[in-house]
């Protein structure tokens, strides 16, 4: 058993049939010695008397808010949550495995630039009685500060018969150094509490590995006289790190015909303009990636050719 | 470069960008492999990193690029020695068309661009001996290449910025 926060305790349980559970001793936070009784949740039924209450915690029926009373007045509370371990593995019932980029990916994180700001998100099918808290640091043995904002419900989607909820959080490294080579990874820890179930999820990454630029902006097409060719231009996204002479992007461009099956020629360039043949009903697209480190490509930005 | 002369920024830019390409072709799936393990915070101390105080940011380069260039050169020599060590030459043998050979040569080439003949900066000691097991060697290769990718990315940014803003 360990204290998650004031008056909230997590009991770690090996979860198998007829498991013995954990013996927990609760102590009433009061100078009083006599006439103390204990109850659980909204029930007024007395579970025991005395300054301490010893319980055998085996399952969720044993978890909840224990309160000690004297003379009809509540003296202190202890909320017991359970953290299940099955076959040596902590339960992951609350969050959905996103399976990208690999199995057992519950938290996904992205950064739009090297400023030390990043966003993490996760998915669940649970709609009520759910709370999350997030902590983050750079490194774990001698952690450096990362400040995370409030967790927000960022999207709701219908997946077949189920509704899926996406939660996200934004974090900022306190003393980010965009130009340096990261030596220690960022650690993100999410505590999830669903009713009386506690779970925790972690992710460890370098900002450089989770970079995904925003799509290029201001796509423009300029037809060339007496030619089927068009000069296309675009700009770095506003959210990308500056100066661009230092934080450079590379681009992938393509012209896509109306038919998805039509062959697309992709061209890679470090410039912010190109000359392409852009037929009627086709569209021109461009995406961006860090020029020197192969992290994610941005989403495509597109304009119609006509 | 030592003693305050400017490097051939444009040449360094080209070669460092080539290094980036080679480092990724030597170990392309790096983003999908989680090679970090318990205790990695300690093992990463072995390799030289371009850190915050090394003056490799745009402002630091403008003020005095020498600190940064010295740091980059130290790292290049360190990785060049690693790629020439039995970590990479021992079993399991690299494929004949492996880019590691080119990568090794390019590291040497760029480090020489930063130090003309006759100048000798102190360099870091080569790290501890190579592991004996082939599988350990393979894992160490991946870790070194992953670390090299991060190092050469910063170096390439430095030379690109230098070529654009500091070239005479």
């Amino acid at each position: 058993i360990w204290e998650l926060k004031k008056d909230v305790y997590v009991v770690e349980l090996d979860w198998y049939p007829d498991a013995p559970g954990e013996m927990v001793v609760l102590t009433c936070d009061t100078p009083e010695e006599d006439g103390i009784t204990w109850t659980l949740d909204q029930s007024g039924e007395v579970l025991g008397s005395g300054k301490t209450l010893t319980i055998q915690v085996k399952e969720f029926g044993d978890a909840g808010q224990y309160t000690c009373h004297k003379g009809g007045e509540a003296l202190s509370h202890s909320l017991l949550l359970l953290h299940k371990k099955e076959d040596g593995i902590w339960s992951t019932d609350v969050l959905k495995d996103q399976k990208e980029p690999k199995n057992k990916t519950f938290l996904r994180c992205e950064a739009k630039n090297y400023s030390g700001r990043f966003t993490c998100w996760w998915l669940t099918t649970i709609s009520t009685d759910l709370t999350f808290s997030v902590k983050s640091s750079r490194g774990s043995s001698n952690p450096q500060g990362v400040t995370c904002g409030a967790v927000t419900l960022s999207a709701e989607r219908v997946r077949g018969d189920n509704k899926e909820y996406e939660y996200s959080v934004e974090c900022q490294e306190d003393s980010a150094c965009p130009a340096a080579e990261e030596r220690l990874p960022i650690e993100v820890m999410v505590d999830a509490i669903h009713k009386l179930k506690y779970e925790n999820y972690t992710s460890s990454f370098f900002i450089r590995d989770i970079i995904k630029p925003d799509p290029p902006k201001n796509l423009q097409l300029k037809p060339l006289k007496n030619s089927r060719q068009v000069e296309v231009s675009w700009e770095y996204p506003d959210t990308w790190s500056t100066p661009h002479s230092y934080f450079s992007l590379t681009f992938c461009i393509q012209v896509q015909g109306k038919s998805k099956r039509e062959k697309k020629d992709r061209i890679f360039t470090d410039k912010t303009s190109a000359t392409v043949i852009c037929r009627k009903n086709a569209s021109f697209s461009v995406q961006a990636q860090d020029r020197y480190y192969s992290s994610s490509w941005s989403e495509w930005a597109s304009v119609p050719c006509s | 470069v030592p003693g305050g002369s400017s490097p051939a920024w444009a040449q360094c830019q080209q070669l460092s960008q080539k290094l980036c390409t080679l480092a990724w072709s030597a170990h392309p799936l790096v983003g999908h492999m989680d090679l970090r393990e318990e205790g990695d915070e300690e093992t990463t101390n072995d390799v030289p990193h371009i850190q915050c105080g090394d003056g490799c940011d745009p402002q630091g380069l403008r003020d005095n690029s020498q600190f940064c260039l010295q740091r980059i050169r130290q790292g290049l020599i360190f990785y060049e020695k690693l790629l020439g060590s039995d970590i990479f030459t021992g079993e399991p043998s690299l494929l004949p068309d492996s880019p590691v050979g080119q990568l090794h040569a390019s590291l040497l080439g760029l480090s020489q661009l930063l130090q003309p003949e006759g100048h000798h900066w102190e360099t870091q000691q080569i790290p501890s001996p190579s592991p004996s097991q082939p599988w350990q060697r393979l894992l160490l290769r991946f870790k070194i290449l992953r670390s090299l990718q991060a190092f050469v990315a910063v170096a390439a940014r430095v030379f690109a910025h230098g070529a654009a803003t500091l070239s005479p």
Partner: nanobody, 122 residues
């Protein structure tokens, strides 16, 4: 809908024995403490005995040494074995259980049975 149904109450001679049973049924997620209370005519309802989920019993002074509370968690039942009954044990005996239901599956609330009459004649 949750129901607590008591049984076993009847007229018995002083010094005799009775066994009361209570079964909880309906949509029940889990049961915490289960208890027996009684209310004699013109008096307040008083606790007789309680048993926790783990099986620890607790008795009111009037029940000590004569009454035994037991429960079967698998069947959601609680029993009260009453020996050496006295006329002052005459009362309606109520079963009480702290239940979690699907609506409140992480909060225990108290549910009561309708009661069973025990009469001890001298």
């Amino acid at each position: 809908e949750v129901q607590l149904v008591e049984s076993g109450g009847e007229l018995v001679q002083a010094g005799g024995s009775l066994r009361l049973s209570c079964a909880a049924s309906g949509s029940i997620v889990s049961i915490s403490a289960m208890a027996w209370y009684r209310q004699a005519p013109g008096k307040q309802r008083e606790r007789v005995a309680t048993i926790t989920r783990g099986g620890t019993p607790d008795y009111a002074d009037s029940a000590k040494d004569r009454f035994t509370i037991s429960r079967d968690n698998a069947k959601n039942t609680v029993s009260l074995q009453m020996n050496n009954l006295k006329p002052e044990d005459t009362a309606v005996y109520y079963c009480k259980a702290a239940l979690r239901t699907p609506t409140h599956d992480y909060n225990y609330y108290d549910y009561w049975g309708q009661g069973t009459q025990v009469t001890v004649s001298s």
